[in-house]
Amino acid sequence: SITGISPITESLASLSTYNDQSITFALEDESYEIYVEDLKKDKKKDKVLLSYYESQHPSSESGDGVDGKMLMVTLSPTKDFWLQANNKEHSVELHKCEKPLPDQAFFVLHNRSFNCVSFECKTDPGVFIGVKDNHLALIKVDYSENLGSENILFKLSEILEHHHHHH
């Protein structure tokens, strides 16, 4: 369960892959598509609002026997839309939803040497947001400290402007 209904902090950032490709969001046919692509130099990176929550995470749910307070995150690239895990389809989708957000919108945040982060599904421990065929997908990872596969590693670049500009 999420400890508090409000996040402990929020930040505005651009999201890129380990190989410095940008994560972009495009409105197509009244729904959002998520792309992983090389950005032209002059093109502005898409912004994502990251909201950080503290959560209790029982050991029975975790791939490595970890319990205790976890740091979780939701990702919102545009107002009222959040990244969500679709575990049945092994896909990552953008859905419009109201608060309280569903569990599928929460991801356990993992740091790898602080240069990169990875996002583990709250609803499916051991499954991470990753890159597959220039799209985001859910990828099962054999749990180890490395979480080493580059396709589940992402970089966050802070955008220093007031959060409200995002919406």
């Epitope: 402990i8 902090t9 950080y52 026997g65 205790g68 993992h110 740091n111 240069n115 802070e158």
Partner: antibody
């Protein structure tokens, strides 16, 4: 309640090694990482490195790489920090500190040990 | 390494005063900043984490604000037990680094 209890003060000669212990209680030891932070007399705080209690994975500050070893003993819920080739600049109080969040290192601490004074003198 | 610059290095104040301490990071650290209070011979005690979150059990006269590179710790009404040294710490990138400290002394 969560407690981190450290070993007693040590006096060492230059070139020697010291091993400081930090015994944890009041929580599931393997769920949280432990960092070590030192403070020279009258000086500020300096992060030395981190160990994940669950599997012994470590991340050391470059300054201490090759001279420090952090370990854990999950049977006794104890973390250890060994510093080798001591010199007078290593005279400091050494603290252990518990990660605020389990599962991954985020650099946030909530509980600290009481500190262990290590004096290096010939 | 990210440099954390705290100011002032010391401040003289009286009980009841409002005290403000600032911390500047050499590069953006999102909101990953903590504030600690340390008294002589004691371990640091967490006051604020993630820039603005009050640690459980810490009096509400302590507050934190800021994001990116500039952060502030405010003590709204200084109490006798608040005379101590205060440190900021960034938790955004390795190695973790601390500010040089601000000593709050009795005027």
């Amino acid at each position: 309640q969560v407690q981190l209890v450290q070993s007693g003060a040590e006096v060492k000669k230059p070139g020697a090694s010291v091993k400081v212990s930090c015994k944890a209680s009041g929580y599931t030891f393997t769920s949280y990482g432990i960092s070590w932070v030192r403070q020279a007399p009258g000086q500020g705080l300096e992060w030395m490195g981190w160990i994940r209690a669950y599997n012994g994975y470590t991340n050391y500050a470059q300054k201490f790489q090759g001279r420090v070893t952090m370990t854990t003993d999950t049977s006794t819920n104890t973390a250890y920090m060994e510093l080798r080739t001591l010199n007078s600049d290593d005279t400091a109080v050494y603290y252990c500190a518990r990660d605020r969040y389990s599962g991954s290192f985020h650099g946030n601490f909530d509980y600290w040990g009481q500190g262990t004074l290590v004096t290096v003198s010939s | 390494d990210i440099q954390m610059t705290q100011s002032p290095s010391s401040v003289s104040a009286s009980v009841g005063d409002r005290v403000t301490i600032t911390c500047r990071a050499s590069q953006g650290i999102f909101s990953w900043l903590a504030w600690y209070q340390q008294k002589p011979g004691k371990a640091p005690k967490v006051l604020i984490y993630a820039a603005s979150n009050l640690e459980s059990g810490v009096p509400s006269r302590f507050s934190g604000s800021g994001s990116g590179t500039d952060f502030t710790l405010t003590i709204s009404s200084l109490q006798p037990e608040d005379f101590a040294t205060y440190y900021c710490q960034q938790a955004n990138s390795l190695p973790l680094t601390f500010g040089g400290g601000t000593k709050v002394e009795i005027k």
